[in-house]
Interface confidence: low
């Protein structure tokens, strides 16, 4: 089975984790995907490790774990997420995830935040 | 340069185990996939199984419980227990299958006939 | 399981043909499929990995297309020596499969 948190939210600008529990006594895991809607975010395989997809790669973090970090969220993140495993014997399993990026609290309290990089 | 070469009985008698041997020089088996493969005479290609560079082993639903394969230092093997007239085949070796860039390159092939 | 249907199961063309051959995935494989040529008696040879990458030493009259399900191998101009047998092949899992390969597409001489 699929164990995870199927909503949780983030502010725009953060990170979060997006993690998924496989549980079998039997069935042991070969491969994980992970996708924002249709689009591939990345997949990992026992023998080969992690692959990134090219698009979100400098967003998207492998782990902890069969997980992913995901960085500098935008609004444009928020949507469903889903991770799919594939587990020898025993097949495929999913789980689903929805994550909503809010406004950071510093926006929503109505505060512009400068950020002045030093020079040279 | 890269070559894979099969061998082993060319005849098998029913019921008993087809064992053949992939050896490979050119390349690391410590880091490669190597795939076997067969094709019954006049049909099309038929995936036996999979081994990876840690050892880890993935065969097709018809071999499961029949088939083994394991590797040592240069060379990969593959058993197939209780044969039939239907495991009349050539059977290939090949690098790669997963993942990869194709499997490449394969052996020549070796042909095993069952019957008595 | 991902089963892999080739189509057409064979075909008949002339040299300086443009053959197309097409190969569907039940489920998104994404870029991982292969296409091999095979000769009567000989191993297959690779063509193309990763859905369009052309194998080393293959002529450029090959080229591969698709991604996800549905994918492409096409001939620009066929050559008397490419008269053969074609096969597609998954790598986007190997757990829990029948057969990584697609059936064949036999090219014959019109």
């Known amino acids: 089975t699929i164990d995870t948190k199927r909503n949780i939210s983030a502010e725009e600008g953060g990170s979060v984790i997006l993690q998924c529990h496989f549980s079998s006594d039997t069935a042991e895991v070969t491969q994980v995907d992970w996708k924002q809607q249709d689009q591939l975010l990345a997949i990992y395989s026992v023998d080969l490790g992690w692959h990134v997809a090219s698009v979100f790669s400098d967003r998207v973090v492998p782990g902890p774990s069969l997980g992913l970090t995901f960085q500098s969220l935008t609004m444009n993140d928020t949507g469903e997420y889903f991770c799919t495993y594939h587990t020898y014997p025993g097949g495929i399993y999913k789980g689903r995830i929805f994550l909503k990026v809010q406004e950071s609290s510093d926006d929503r309290n109505g505060l512009a935040q400068f950020q002045t990089a030093p020079l040279g | 340069q890269v070559q894979l070469q099969e061998s082993g009985p060319g005849l098998v008698k029913p019921s008993e185990t087809l064992s053949l041997t992939c050896t490979v020089s050119g390349f690391s088996l410590s880091s490669s996939y190597m795939s076997w493969i067969r094709q019954p005479p006049g049909k099309g290609l038929e995936w036996i199984g999979i081994?990876?560079?840690?050892?880890n082993t993935y065969y097709a639903n018809w071999a499961k419980g029949r088939v083994t394969i394991s590797k040592s230092s240069n060379q990969v093997s593959l058993k197939l227990s209780s044969v039939t007239a239907a495991d009349t085949a050539v059977y290939y070796c090949a690098r790669g299958g997963y993942r990869t860039s194709g499997m490449d390159p394969w052996g020549q092939g070796t042909l095993v006939t069952v019957s008595s | 399981d991902i089963q892999m249907t080739q189509s057409p199961s064979s075909l008949s063309a002339s040299v300086g043909d443009r053959v197309t051959i097409t190969c569907q995935a039940s489920q998104n494989i994404y870029s991982d499929l292969a296409w091999y040529q095979q000769k009567p008696g000989k191993a297959p040879k690779l063509l193309i990995y990763?859905?369009?990458t052309l194998a080393s030493g293959v002529p450029s009259r090959f080229s591969g297309s698709g991604s996800g399900t549905d994918f492409t191998l096409t001939i620009s101009s066929l050559q008397p020596e490419d008269f053969a047998t074609y096969y597609c092949q998954q790598e986007h899992l190997v757990a829990w499969i029948y057969n990584v390969f697609g059936q064949g597409t036999k090219v014959e001489i019109k």
């Open positions: 990763r859905a369009s």
């Open positions: 081994i990876g560079s840690n050892g």
